[in-house]
């Protein structure tokens, strides 16, 4: 098994300062790690670029309640 | 970092009405999609309900719906499950949950957690 203590970090050092279509974004994921300078989610668009977004905005909680709500299922 | 702190617990009869509540502190509160799972005793943990961001939308398991209510209120950094017509079975442990990764009732999705609060419905 690797030693996840050693595995590296995606941190995100700048956000992009324009809005994107939700219709462009595939998936995100959040970066929560202490190590990081800033807390951030990176968005991967459906042509599979990666962009740093500021979670504290607007938009960016929008498109993750948007993209959220596609993974939802009738199951429960 | 979020920390998150329930309470509202106790004991109640059936068909009786108990209000859990969820405080966050750390980051961004408004950032997370919040959920209420519960865990009985023997059983696995049992998703509850979600809310997103924004607080438009909510979905509810089967076994709640029509019978309890989640919301929040980004100012007050505070998540609520508003909870009517409780019978035994729903006697658990509740906790609340913050949603940082992509996806809706899975527990794997949800970063943080509270330390549960106690429901006991009794007959």
């Known amino acids: 098994q690797p030693d996840a203590i050693n595995a590296p970090v995606t941190c995100c050092y700048n956000f992009t300062n324009r809005k994107i279509s939700v219709q462009r974004l595939a998936s995100y994921r959040r970066i929560t790690s202490s190590k990081c300078p800033k807390e951030a989610v990176i968005f991967k668009t459906i042509v599979a670029k990666e962009i740093c977004a500021d979670p504290k905005q607007k938009w960016v909680q929008d498109s993750m309640d948007h993209l959220d709500k596609q993974t939802q299922t009738p199951k429960t | 970092e979020v920390q998150l702190v329930e309470s509202g617990g106790g004991l109640v009869q059936a068909g009786g009405s108990l209000r859990l509540s969820c405080a966050a502190s750390?980051?961004?509160?408004?950032?997370?999609?919040m959920g209420w799972f519960r865990q009985a005793p023997e059983k696995e943990r049992e998703f509850v309900a979600v809310?997103?961001?924004?607080?438009?939308?909510?979905f509810y398991s089967n076994s709640v719906k029509g019978r309890f209510t989640i919301s929040r209120d980004n100012a007050k950094n505070t998540v609520y499950l508003q909870m009517n017509s409780l019978k035994p079975e729903d006697t658990a442990v509740y906790y609340c949950?913050?949603?940082?990764?992509?996806?809706?009732?899975?527990?794997?999705?949800?970063?943080?957690w509270g330390q549960g609060t106690q429901v006991t419905v009794s007959s």
């Open positions: 949950a913050a949603g940082a990764q992509m996806g809706w009732a899975e527990a794997s999705t949800y970063d943080y």
């Open positions: 750390g980051r961004t509160f408004s950032s997370y999609r």
């Open positions: 809310i997103t961001r924004s607080g438009g939308s909510t």
